[in-house]
Structure formats: structure tokens, C-alpha cells
């Protein structure tokens, strides 16, 4: 499948984050997987996702740096090809945002795609 | 006392293969990220691979990419490297290091030399 | 992909000195700045991590600043075991990770 697009970054509350993407087909046979990492990290902490294009982050620091990235892959239970997509581009988001009130809480894209 | 130690490296020929190793103690090691960085003789650092703690995602160098391999075994405490088709360029001391961005701890180095 | 461009290539100072070694990003990395140290024929030594923290075990005469593009590594009074070469690297666009050209640090 294409690597995921569009990813945007909203505050579900004063400690939780959620993170939305786009798939060019949307499909139930689809699985995710999400990376995140804050500026403190030394490595990626990784959560699988199902079908739905959403991730939630229950627990955030607001002193800290976010960054997330997506890939995607049809899931083996459906007989299809398991390979994983490519990274998304990465979608970074800082204490400044979580601050902030509005519900769209990162604007800032890299535009660089991310290879496994 | 945490340590990284190399091994593997030699003089090789244009095109040709080696697998470094890298032997992890004294911190847990599928709790990190790791890396390779080389450092060519009395040149800089140079960052050209890393995977993820489970060994499920890796990222590589363009100057690297298609040519080198970058693998764990965390039951052994391991973190591999196999490179091919190897170009005069290649030439350096390879570091592995604990991190997938960030590089806590460092091994001494393995020293790989490409020569006709 | 990011260049990081440290400045100056090369410093001479004298053991007491305060020393300013400094790191610009061609775009911004927020605060994904690490910094090394590397003592001939030695590993590096990770320092400084998200631009300002401390690494654990470092003496605090070293500290880090800077946010965006620009960002500097200090050694408020320089010791004997502190001349050795500098790096900075970034994190914030991987990959790939990319590092500065380094800084060496020697004795007047």
C-alpha cells in the first residue's frame, strides 16, 4: 500500500493526544503501525493500530517534543501481501502547541519521506 | 559498566562483503534502538543506519542504502551489519551505538578497510 | 536533508577559559539537538541531549542552549580533560540523522 498521508494532530484533552491519517484506499484489511519519539527519546516507541486510522496517546508531557510517523500494511488475516508501506512523512508537534486552545494543534510537516 | 564491542571488520576488495558485530552488555538491550556510525580516517561522524528495539524497522544512509543490512538477535545481546559491494569509500571505523537517533553509549569501533 | 554547520572549526583556549562552540541547522530541528565529545582515538561521549539536558555523569561546567536553527554547546571554565573535538548532531529529520563538521578543542 502507499504510505499514509495527511497526518494531523489533535488534543483530546490537557494530557492526550490524538493522531488521525489518510490512507489512498480505505480498506478494512488495512493495519497500521505508529512510531512516536519526544526530544528526550533514544528510540522510537512503537503501538500497532487496526483498521480504524486513529492513535491515542493517553499520556503526554507538555515539556516535551512529539513526533510521530505511520506506515501501513494489508493485514496477513486477509490473504494479502504483508508487506509494510513506506514511513509517512513525519508530523511533529511541541509544547507550544499543546498549549494552545484550538483543536488542530500541528501545522508543521516535514517534507521528507522515510524509508524502512 | 555498560559495553559495546565490535568485531568483524578487516581489509577487503572492491565489491566485496563483511559482517560486523556488535556484543551489548551492562544495560538492557531490547529496551534500545541501534545504530551504526563510521568515522573515516581523520574525517568526521557519519550516521548510516539504525533499527528499532524489536528488529522490525531500520533506516539507512543513501550512501549505504541497497548495499548494507542492518540486523539484531536480542536473545544474544547482537547487533549486526552486513555489507556488500563495498567501495573504496566505505572506508572507515564503524561504531555501533546504543540509540536509534540519540547515542547514549558507543563502542571503541571496528575498523573496515576497502583496497585493491 | 539537514546540514549542520558548527563554527569555529577550530579554537585554541586556556584551562579556566569559558568556551562557546556553536551549531546552526539550514532549517529548523525545534530542540532535536545532541552534542558529543570525542577524545583522540577514543569512542564519543554523548553530553548534551534535546539541546540543553545534561547527559547523565556530565560535569555541569558543560551546558547546552538554543531552539530552531541556533544552538550552543558552553564549557564554563575549561578543565585539562576538555580538549578533544566537538559535534553536534540532529534528530529532528530522520533519516538521516546528520552530524557537524566538529570542533577542535585545543590547548593555548
Known amino acids: 500500500p502507499w504510505a499514509p498521508e495527511n497526518l494531523t494532530l489533535h488534543k483530546l484533552s490537557e494530557s492526550q493526544l490524538e493522531l488521525n491519517w489518510n490512507n489512498r484506499f480505505l480498506n478494512h484489511c488495512l493495519e497500521h503501525l505508529v512510531q512516536y519519539r519526544t526530544d528526550w527519546d533514544h528510540s522510537w516507541t512503537e503501538q500497532s493500530v487496526d483498521y480504524r486510522h486513529k492513535f491515542s496517546l493517553p499520556s503526554v508531557d507538555g515539556q516535551k517534543r512529539y513526533t510521530f510517523r505511520v506506515r501501513s500494511r494489508f493485514n496477513p488475516l486477509c490473504g494479502s501481501a504483508q508487506h509494510w508501506s513506506e514511513w509517512s512523512e513525519q508530523k511533529l508537534i511541541s509544547e507550544e502547541d499543546l498549549g494552545g486552545e484550538q483543536k488542530l494543534i500541528s501545522e508543521e510537516d516535514l517534507h521528507h519521506h522515510h524509508h524502512h | 559498566e555498560v559495553q559495546l564491542v565490535e568485531s568483524g571488520g578487516g581489509v577487503v576488495r572492491p565489491g566485496g562483503s563483511l559482517r560486523l558485530s556488535c556484543a551489548a552488555s551492562?544495560?538492557?538491550?531490547?529496551?534500545?534502538?541501534m545504530s551504526w556510525v563510521r568515522q573515516a580516517p581523520g574525517k568526521g561522524l557519519e550516521w548510516i543506519s539504525s533499527?528499532?528495539?524489536?528488529?522490525?524497522?531500520?533506516d539507512y544512509a543513501d550512501s549505504v542504502k541497497g548495499r548494507f543490512t542492518i540486523s539484531r538477535d536480542n536473545a544474544k545481546n547482537s547487533l549486526f551489519l552486513q555489507m556488500s559491494s563495498l567501495r573504496a569509500e566505505d572506508t572507515a571505523l564503524y561504531h555501533c551505538a546504543s540509540g536509534e537517533f540519540r547515542f547514549d553509549y558507543w563502542g571503541q569501533g571496528t575498523l573496515v578497510t576497502v583496497s585493491s | 536533508d539537514i546540514q549542520m554547520t558548527q563554527s569555529p572549526s577550530s579554537l585554541s583556549a586556556s584551562v579556566g577559559d569559558r568556551v562557546t562552540i556553536t551549531c546552526r541547522a539550514s532549517?529548523?530541528?525545534?530542540?532535536?539537538l545532541n552534542w558529543y565529545q570525542q577524545k583522540p582515538g577514543k569512542a564519543p561521549k554523548l553530553l548534551i541531549y534535546a539541546a540543553s539536558s545534561l547527559q547523565s555523569g556530565v560535569p555541569s561546567r558543560f551546558s547546552g542552549s538554543g531552539s530552531g536553527t541556533d544552538f550552543t554547546l558552553t564549557i564554563s571554565s575549561l578543565q585539562p580533560e576538555d580538549f578533544a573535538t566537538y559535534y553536534c548532531q540532529q534528530s529532528y529529520s530522520t533519516p538521516p540523522i546528520t552530524f557537524g563538521q566538529g570542533t577542535r578543542l585545543e590547548i593555548k
Open positions: 551492562g544495560f538492557t538491550f531490547d529496551d534500545y534502538g
Open positions: 532549517q529548523s530541528i525545534s530542540s532535536y
Open positions: 533499527i528499532n528495539r524489536n528488529g522490525g524497522s531500520a
